[in-house]
């Protein structure tokens, strides 16, 4: 897929791994959150 | 042209929250990542923190983590950053900033400056 | 953090003068890709900071030719040719070669 404009900003390049990492964490206490809150529904 | 207007100075007391904005002008707003940074009285700078404005992925140094609350709004070209929990310590001036494809903090914003006092 | 260490805090000149600022990373700040992310911006008084220099040794546009930058690893310079009146101020120089981000702590260039 071709690359958004903002890849050519340095600062993409330069924290690509770290705002993946970011995403990822954020991603995943997203569904930790979305999993409690199932929990309590059910409940 | 490339523009960063930053809002204009607060004076707040301890324990409160501020919201400062960056609007962009002369460039595509979604085509650079949004940096801030901090410098209090006569003393170096901080970088606080980075965002995406295409899709609002924020990336902070550990120091500001909690402090600073970086947010986007794309329709009016406008960065902004939140500070809560203010103290003493947070009295300085705040910059945002923009890179280029070769070299980080190309242009920057006039600053606002954040006092923070009883 | 890499801590960024400029000598001198301060630094007299007089205009027409060469002055040359010493900027020393506790670590070496030559990225994974190879490049070397070491910026310098100067702030003049009651200004922003404006970008000099980048990757080392490049020029921004609209930057002089009086303003040098070399050095390689741990240890750079930037120099100044002939300063005039328009260059006093603060001197910074950051590294972005690894997170986080940092400055060093600033050299004030005023006349003597």
């Known amino acids: 897929s071709e690359e958004p404009p903002i890849s050519l900003d340095l600062t993409f390049h330069l924290l690509r791994e770290v705002l993946e990492m970011a995403r990822a964490e954020q991603l995943a206490q997203q569904a930790h959150s979305n999993r409690k809150l199932m929990e309590i529904i059910g409940k | 042209e490339v523009q960063l207007q930053q809002s204009g100075p607060e004076l707040v007391k301890p324990g409160a929250s501020v919201k400062m904005s960056c609007k962009a002008s002369g460039y595509t707003f979604t085509d650079y990542f949004m940096k801030w940074m901090k410098q209090s009285h006569g003393k170096s700078l901080e970088w606080i923190g980075v965002?995406?404005?295409?899709?609002?992925?924020?990336f902070y140094n550990q120091n500001f983590k909690g402090k600073a609350t970086l947010t986007v709004d794309k329709s009016s070209s406008t960065a902004y950053m939140q500070l809560n929990s203010l103290t003493s310590e947070d009295s300085a001036v705040y910059y945002c900033t923009r890179g280029t494809a070769r070299a980080l903090f190309a242009y920057w914003g006039q600053g606002t400056l954040v006092t923070v006092s009883a | 953090d890499v801590l960024m260490t400029q000598t001198p805090l301060s630094l007299p000149v007089s205009l027409g003068d060469q002055a040359s600022i010493s900027c020393r990373s506790s670590q070496s700040i030559v990225h994974s890709d190879g490049n070397t992310y070491l910026e310098w911006y100067l702030q003049r008084p009651g200004q922003s900071p404006k970008l000099l220099i980048y990757k080392v040794s490049n020029r921004f546009s609209g930057v002089p030719d009086r303003f040098s930058g070399s050095g390689s690893g741990t240890d750079f310079t930037l120099k100044i040719s002939r300063v005039g009146a328009e260059d006093l101020g603060v001197y910074y120089c950051f590294q972005g070669s690894h997170v986080p981000w940092t400055f060093g702590g600033g050299t004030k260039l005023e006349v003597k």
């Open positions: 965002i995406n404005p295409n899709n609002g992925d924020t």
